[in-house]
C-alpha cells in the first residue's frame, strides 16, 4: 500500500525532514507550508492550522519560497546615471546597471552603490586599458610616432602617417602633415576604437527589511568629485 500523504501541518518522522517547500516550525514542532515568491507569512502555523500567506506590500518582494514575516524592501529607484534593467516586483528586487559610458566606482556586496563616468583621455593621450563595468579607463601618453587628437574614452594612440615629404611633423596630439604626394601608414588608416564596455553584471540593490519592520535608506551615497588622472578630462 502506498504511504499516506501527509497534509501540512504534520509532525515529521523522528529524525526525518520536512518536504520541499515546507519548513519545520520550532514553536509548533510541525512541518508547515512555506509561502511562494511574492508572498510572506502573515500568520505562522500552529499544531492545527497551516501557515497563512499574504502578498508582498507595495515596493517589497520575496524571491524564494519563504516563511518571513515581512517581505524585503526593494532598493531605491535607479539614479540618473543608471538604467533599470529589472523592475521591482513582488517576486524580484529592482536591478540597476550603469549607463553606457559609466562604470561601477563603488561596489558593494551585491552590485553597485555608485556609478561614475568613464575617464576621457585628452589629446596627446590614448587609452592604455579600456574601461570595464567595474574599472575606469587608464590613459597613457602617446609614444613617439603615435598621436591622439581626440578627447575620448575609447580612442587609442594611432601611428603618424608616413610622408614622402613631411610638411609638418606629427606630435603626440597631432598627425603628421604631408606635402601633396600621397602618404602611407605603418598601420591601417583611420581611428582605432575600443568597444564600450557592456554592463551585464547585475547590480542589485541591497535587500533590506520592509519599512514596517526596519526602514531602509537610500543607497546612493554622495561622493565628491575626484581629481582627474593624468591625461584625462573631467567632462
Amino acid at each position: 500500500l502506498p504511504a499516506q500523504v501527509a497534509f501540512t501541518p504534520y509532525a515529521p518522522e523522528p529524525g526525518g525532514t520536512c518536504r520541499l517547500r515546507e519548513y519545520y516550525d520550532q514553536t509548533a514542532q510541525m512541518c508547515c507550508s512555506k509561502c511562494p515568491p511574492g508572498q510572506h507569512a502573515k500568520v505562522f502555523c500552529t499544531k492545527t492550522s497551516d501557515t497563512v500567506c499574504d502578498s508582498c506590500e507595495d515596493s517589497t518582494y520575496t524571491q524564494l519560497w519563504n516563511w518571513v514575516p515581512e517581505c524585503l524592501s526593494c532598493g531605491s529607484r535607479c539614479s540618473s546615471d543608471q538604467v533599470e534593467t529589472q523592475a521591482c516586483t513582488r517576486e524580484q528586487n529592482r536591478i540597476c546597471t550603469c549607463r553606457p559610458g559609466w562604470y561601477c566606482a563603488l561596489s558593494k556586496q551585491e552590485g553597485c552603490r555608485l556609478c561614475a563616468q568613464l575617464r576621457k583621455c585628452r589629446p596627446g593621450f590614448g587609452v592604455a586599458r579600456p574601461g570595464t563595468e567595474t574599472s575606469d579607463v587608464v590613459c597613457k601618453p602617446c609614444a613617439p610616432g603615435t598621436f591622439s587628437n581626440t578627447t575620448s574614452s575609447t580612442d587609442i594612440c594611432r601611428p603618424h602617417q608616413i610622408c614622402h615629404v613631411v610638411a609638418i611633423p606629427g606630435n603626440a596630439s597631432m598627425d603628421a602633415v604631408c606635402t601633396s604626394t600621397s602618404p602611407t601608414r605603418s598601420m591601417a588608416p583611420g581611428a582605432v576604437h575600443l568597444p564600450q564596455p557592456v554592463s551585464t553584471r547585475s547590480q542589485h540593490t541591497q535587500p533590506t527589511p520592509a519599512p514596517s519592520t526596519a526602514p531602509g535608506t537610500s543607497f546612493l551615497l554622495p561622493v565628491g568629485p575626484s581629481p582627474p588622472a593624468e591625461g584625462s578630462t573631467g567632462d
Partner: antibody, heavy 120, light 108 residues
Framework: EVQLQESGPEIVKPGASVKLSCTAS????????MHWVKQRPEQGLEWIGR????????KHDPKFQDKATLSSDTSSNTAYLQFSSLTSEDTAVYYC?????????????WGQGTTVTVSS | DIQMTQSPAIMSASLGERVTMTCTAS???????LHWYQQKPGSSPKLWIY???NLPSGVPARFSGSGSGTSYSLTISSMEAEDAATYYC?????????FGGGTKLEIK
C-alpha cells in the same frame, strides 16, 4: 499619453450614496495601484484608500472603512469609489491617483478631480 | 497612524529668495517612502519630489529635497513666481498613508 479621466460633478442629498469612476489610459504597467484622495474646500489632502486592480485587494484609512467601497473593472481600466451615507462633511473634491508598484507609493498621475456636493 | 506636520502653514517669499519648508513625522519614515506634491488653486496635485530628494522630469532644478527619519524639508534655491502654490508632504511608510497639512507659499 497617460491620463486618468474622472466622472463628472455630483450633487447628492444627505444619506444618499454616490459612485465615482476613474478611467485610466496610456498605462503599460499592469503592476499599479489606484488611490483615492479627498480634499474638502480650502483644506488639505486626505488619503481614503487604494485598490490593486489586478487582484482587487483594497486598503483603506480606517476612518473611511465603513464609508468608502473601492472596486475596479480591469476590462475597462476603470476604478470606482462608492461613498455611502453622505453628510455635509463629505462635500469635497475626490481625486484618483496612480502609483506604480515599486515606486514607494509616489502618486505620479492624478485625475482632474470630481466635485461632490452634499446638499438637501 | 503617522502624523505629518508641515511648517510653516503659510509663508511668503520674495522673487529670488531661498525658501525652505519642513515636514515632521510623528514616527520614523524611510526616506524612500517620503514624497512631496505641489498643488495650485483649481488644479490637481502634482508629484513634485519623490523618495525625499528625486525630481520627476519637468520639475525645475531649483527645487531640492532632503531629510531622514522624522525630519524632511523641501528647498527652493531661488523663488520664482510660478512656485507660488501649496506643497504637501506624504508618507507611504505605514498604512494608513498620510499627507501633511500643507505649506502655502505666496509671493511677497
Amino acid at each position: 499619453e497617460v491620463q486618468l479621466q474622472e466622472s463628472g460633478p455630483e450633487i447628492v442629498k444627505p444619506g444618499a450614496s454616490v459612485k465615482l469612476s476613474c478611467t485610466a489610459s496610456g498605462f503599460n504597467n499592469k503592476d499599479i495601484y489606484m488611490h483615492w484622495v479627498k480634499q474638502r474646500p480650502e483644506q488639505g489632502l486626505e488619503w481614503i484608500g487604494r485598490i490593486d486592480p489586478a487582484t482587487g485587494n483594497t486598503k483603506h484609512d480606517p476612518k473611511f472603512q465603513d464609508k468608502a467601497t473601492l472596486s475596479s473593472d480591469t476590462s475597462s481600466n476603470t476604478a470606482y469609489l462608492q461613498f455611502s451615507s453622505l453628510t455635509s462633511e463629505d462635500t469635497a473634491v475626490y481625486y484618483c491617483a496612480h502609483s506604480p508598484y515599486g515606486d514607494f507609493g509616489a502618486m505620479d498621475y492624478w485625475g482632474q478631480g470630481t466635485t461632490v456636493t452634499v446638499s438637501s | 497612524d503617522i502624523q505629518m506636520t508641515q511648517s510653516p502653514a503659510i509663508m511668503s517669499a520674495s522673487l529670488g529668495e531661498r525658501v525652505t519648508m519642513t515636514c515632521t513625522a510623528s514616527s520614523s519614515v524611510s526616506s524612500n517612502y517620503l514624497h512631496w506634491y505641489q498643488q495650485k488653486p483649481g488644479s490637481s496635485p502634482k508629484l513634485w519630489i519623490y523618495s525625499t530628494s528625486n525630481l520627476p522630469s519637468g520639475v525645475p532644478a531649483r527645487f531640492s529635497g532632503s531629510g531622514s527619519g522624522t525630519s524632511y524639508s523641501l528647498t527652493i534655491s531661488s523663488m520664482e513666481a510660478e512656485d507660488a502654490a501649496t506643497y504637501y508632504c506624504h508618507q507611504y511608510h505605514r498604512s494608513p498613508w498620510t499627507f501633511g497639512g500643507g505649506t502655502k507659499l505666496e509671493i511677497k
